[in-house]
């Protein structure tokens, strides 16, 4: 029947497993008169045959490793042997079976690694080849460390990238390897095909000898640098050294200071470039970086600590031009009048900022000098000799010397003698009655005016009135502001009123003076007043416990994982239903009752992080009021993007014939997060069969060079498969194809005769 095994002459592709004895025909082509017979040409290798009636078959087992694709042509001939149809391309793709074992390129490898090398950074590659198809498990190699000798405390110091054969240190190896304790290690490495997943896989082993060398790339001890140095700058303060010559050193200022006073030279010596000022900045933390010639970091940055040592370069300063204190007429000896607090910008708790206070002058000296004393270290002024009389001297001026160990400063204090505080404040009303307010009354509203009077000397601390709410407002929803001229008190709302928690509040005010009352006088009921605040209910929307809820999860969490939760309460005590709004990617769902948020689809940091959605809390019943909060899901990166080519490389060509081996540079990238050091890709050819013609060499972490090994290339397109491994955790590998055309050139451009215009390369090498 026409269809799978028979039909007209047209381009076709067939896939046949290698190694199988022929068991059925490939295809029966049907002739259309005047065609009577068929002819087969191309890469038949005397295996593929077409009978005159169009029966295409093969006569012995195929071998993919000899030829992976047979490009055949079938033509229909008339009775004169003239082609009347075709020839059409017939492609036989030979499917791979696992009939080749992997083989290490060397039976023994040797390498060296520095102690404290970055974990995961390859220092040696073992390489095995398998002639089977790398695009199938048959040719997918899986490297493993069979044994590490010596093995200390059962801890593996080395790890191997099971796809690329890159050997690197584990975290423990990075921390614990020490050439003084153990200068050499031996690894036995195995390689299996079938991606290591099948019991039918073939394998090979090799031995790796590793020498551990000392790492001199270490952070120096913290440096202390005296401020305001008068020595000529720059001054060398410390140094770093990379393990090998030729590194390029630089400093990184993580704090982005407007003035960064450090530099590093190409020997790794670190300098301070200008005098430092401890009072501007008392410590610096920055990083020294060593890079290769291509600007890629060779290792992790080293943290450099510089502490700026204080010198006494700041005099004491007074708190204000004149500091004013009050003292009552009848105050007792020793009473505190007030404390003068001077400042010193030098380092706290050192001799440079330790202050002494001394009264150097009192005016007037009536009735005598030395009426006041000051505590030498605390700066507290006290009455020293006798009580004062306002009618004799209403005001005293003191000059106080404040000194540190090198500097002296004069500060001025004015002491006003005021009446004795023998009158208490008296409220004009003891009960301000009831006040009814809705619970949504605005914050800042004045809801009540209260008034007390005090018969003491006006505009002194004895007559000034401070109002306090002493009862009925434990939440601090209310406050009282005092007008200093009239002593009027304005009761204001400081926090939202709440019917649900305090429908009725019995508020008690107390009026008092900032100055103490004289001995024997006490505040009594006259200094107290009350009022009743009645709050009426307003149906309010639920309230979230936070404006923004934030959670952090790894982007590869399993579907159904709880990633966060939100909470809201309804002021009226109604139940709440939670929902999500703006989940544009369909990643999340929320439990309507509990507010727990779960993933419902694979998350992807590369699509955007944080992922922001709104959560809505709605009353169940009632007015169905709702409120909205934000939920921000921060996605932590996992290595889930294989490397790929950074751009489109179609159109690469070499002029044919090659006069000398040529090369071209290509760049790789991937979409995962690369923090300080950027990507660190490794490159290798995608299949063993390419190694006779091509080689790939790494330039840096993102770029590699593809070079021809000889000049004997046919005039056609070659597709070069390249493996790019990102060395991540887990390591991911991409196989990319670079199409390279060898073509006749006219004036440096690829020449194609008319009628062959498809895919003309545009970039010459």
């Amino acid at each position: 029947q026409e269809g799978k095994f028979s039909g007209p002459l047209k381009p076709m592709t067939f896939s046949i497993y290698e190694g199988q004895e022929p068991s059925q025909i490939i295809f029966q082509f049907k002739a259309n008169p005047p065609a009577v017979t068929f002819e087969l040409t191309g890469e038949t290798d005397n295996i593929f045959v077409i009978e005159r009636e169009g029966l295409l078959y093969y006569n012995r087992a195929l071998d993919r490793e000899t030829r992976s694709t047979h490009n055949l042509q079938v033509a229909a001939l008339d009775a004169n042997g003239i082609i009347v149809e075709g020839p059409v391309p017939i492609t036989i793709k030979v499917k791979d079976i696992n009939d080749n074992r992997p083989t290490f390129l060397q039976s023994k490898y040797e390498g060296s690694v520095r102690q404290n090398s970055r974990p995961g950074k390859p220092f040696l590659y073992v390489n095995a080849t398998d002639l089977d198809d790398p695009a199938t498990p048959n040719g997918q190699l899986y490297y493993q460390i069979v044994i590490q000798l010596p093995m200390i405390n059962n801890v593996m110091y080395f790890q191997i990238n099971n796809k690329t054969g890159a050997i690197s240190l584990t975290r423990e190896g990075s921390q614990e390897l020490n050439p003084a304790k153990n200068p050499s290690y031996n690894l036995v490495i195995s390689v299996k095909d079938m991606g290591g997943q099948s019991e039918n896989s073939f394998s090979d082993t090799t031995s790796v000898d590793i020498i551990v060398t000392e790492n001199i790339w270490k952070a120096p001890k913290p440096v202390e640098m005296v401020e305001n140095s008068t020595d000529p700058h720059p001054i060398k303060i410390t140094q770093v050294r990379w393990n090998d010559p030729g590194a390029q050193y630089s400093l990184v200022d993580k704090e982005k200071l407007p003035r960064f006073p450090f530099s590093i030279d190409q020997e790794g010596d670190i300098y301070v470039t200008q005098p430092l000022d401890r009072e501007e900045k008392d410590a610096y933390v920055f990083y020294a970086v060593a890079k290769d010639e291509y600007g890629k970091p060779l290792s992790y940055p080293l943290e450099i600590h510089v502490k700026v040592k204080d010198i006494n370069d700041n005099p004491p300063t007074c708190p204000s031009p004149v500091t004013v204190f009050e003292v009552q007429e009848n105050e007792r000896l020793g009473n505190s009048i007030g404390t003068l607090t001077a400042h010193d910008r030098d380092e706290e708790n050192t001799a440079n900022s330790f202050l002494n206070y001394r009264i150097v002058e009192q005016t007037p000296k009536l009735p005598m000098d030395g009426l006041f004393l000051i505590q030498t270290y605390a700066g507290m002024l006290q009455l020293a000799k006798q009580s004062l009389k306002k009618q004799d001297t209403p005001q005293y001026n003191l000059t106080i010397e404040v000194s540190d160990k090198d500097f002296k400063t004069l500060c001025f204090v004015q002491i006003n003698v005021i009446d004795i505080n023998d009158q208490i404040p008296i409220f004009e009303k003891s009960d301000y009655g009831n006040l009814t307010l809705a619970e949504d009354t605005n914050i800042g509203s004045t809801i009540l005016t209260i008034q007390a009077t005090d018969a003491d000397e006006p505009f002194t601390g004895s007559s000034k009135i401070l109002y306090h709410i002493i009862k009925g407002d434990s939440e601090g929803r209310l406050g009282v502001d005092t007008d200093p001229h009239t002593n009027t008190g304005y009761v204001i709302i400081k926090k939202p009123l709440d019917f649900e928690t305090a429908a009725v509040s019995n508020i008690v005010f107390k009026a008092e003076n900032p100055e103490p009352l004289v001995f024997g006088v006490k505040y009594n009921a006259s200094s107290f007043a009350k009022f009743t605040l009645i709050v009426t209910d307003v149906n309010e929307a639920p309230q979230f416990s936070q404006h923004v809820f934030q959670a952090k999860v790894s982007e590869d969490v399993a579907i159904g994982t709880k990633v966060g939760n939100v909470t809201a309460k309804d002021p009226e005590g109604l139940d709440i239903s939670y929902s999500l709004r703006g989940d544009t990617r369909g990643w999340l769902k929320i439990d309507h009752v509990t507010g727990e948020i779960f993933s419902v689809a694979p998350l992807d940091r590369e699509a955007g992080s944080p992922y922001r959605v709104q959560v809505v809390a709605t009353e169940v019943g009632g007015s169905s009021l709702s409120s909205v909060s934000e939920f921000h899901l921060i996605l932590m990166d996992v290595n889930d993007n294989p490397p790929r080519l950074a751009k489109d490389y179609t159109g690469l060509f070499f002029c044919h014939p090659l006069s000398a081996p040529g090369s071209l540079i290509f760049e790789a990238t991937d979409d995962d997060q690369h923090l300080f050091r950027g990507p660190h890709f490794t490159f290798s050819l995608g299949s063993g069969s390419l190694q006779n013609d091509w080689e790939v060499s790494k330039i840096n972490g993102t770029h590699a060079r593809l070079s021809t090994r000889h000049t004997e290339f046919e005039e056609r397109e070659y597709v070069v498969l390249i493996r790019i491994n990102d060395g991540g955790r887990p390591p991911l590998e991409g196989i990319v194809s670079l199409p390279v055309t060898f073509c006749s050139c006219v004036e440096g451009s690829c020449f194609r005769p008319a009628g062959h215009q498809t895919g003309i390369p545009t970039v010459g090498m």
Epitope: P33, P34, V36, T37, R52, D78, A79, N80, G81, I82
Partner: antibody, heavy 123, light 107 residues
């Protein structure tokens, strides 16, 4: 040995028909195509068409379509060419020839020819 | 149709001469060209096929060359029996066509 023997000369009136035969021997008749050529005195050869006796496939030069019909009789290993509606310009020697190609060969040529048949159209 | 042009309708030469008979195709025919010799009252005889292959039994003094559109039949040393008419023929595409013939005469 291979031989192609054509029928004898014919004199025909305009508007009539003539059937010329070409009897082959010395090979399997169905393996090769038989071609017919026209040659007028002092002129070159013109290819009329061919017949493939095995599958009775024919192909004609567009110029002779409607004028010529090619047939074959496998039982007698004879190929025929019939000319219809004869006119004076049909006067010529008509030759049959074997095309040397057979499946799998590279023999692209007329290797054996008949002796020719003269057809004269005259009133 | 493809025209096969033999520009010399006749050619005079002597015994022992080397002669070349040319044939030009109106479009590319690759190497799908044969040469035939015909004597008066006789059927043509095959000399050369695929532009340059000598047919079995044909003397070696006959050779063919060319491809694409220009073809030549060369007789390296003329013999008395070589005086005849020579035709080229293309079988690259239907309808097949012959040249008008070149008559080789004794000088």
């Amino acid at each position: 040995q291979v031989q192609l023997v054509q029928s004898g000369a014919e004199v025909k009136k305009p508007g009539s028909s003539v059937k010329v035969s070409c009897k082959v021997s010395g090979y399997t008749f169905t393996d090769h195509t038989i071609h017919w050529m026209k040659q007028r005195p002092g002129q070159g050869l013109e290819w009329i068409g061919y017949i493939y006796p095995r599958d009775v496939i024919t192909q004609y030069n567009e110029k002779f379509k409607g004028k010529v019909t090619l047939t074959a009789d496998k039982s007698t290993s004879t190929a025929y060419m019939e000319l219809s509606s004869l006119r004076s310009e049909d006067t010529a020697v008509y030759l049959c020839a074997r095309w040397g190609y057979f499946y799998g060969s590279r023999s692209y040529y007329f290797d054996y020819w008949g002796q020719g048949t003269t057809v004269t159209v005259s009133s | 149709d493809i025209q096969m042009t033999q520009s010399q309708s006749s050619l005079s030469a002597s015994v022992g001469d080397r002669v070349g008979i040319t044939c030009k195709a109106s479009q590319n025919v690759g190497t799908a060209v044969a040469w035939y010799q015909q004597k008066p009252g006789k059927a043509p005889k095959l000399l050369i096929y695929s532009a340059s292959n000598r047919y079995t039994g044909v003397p070696s003094r006959f050779s063919g060359s060319g491809s694409g559109t220009d073809f030549t039949l060369t007789i390296s040393s003329l013999q008395p029996k070589d005086f005849a008419t020579y035709f080229c023929q293309q079988y690259s595409s239907y309808p097949w066509t012959f040249g008008q013939g070149t008559k080789l005469e004794i000088k």
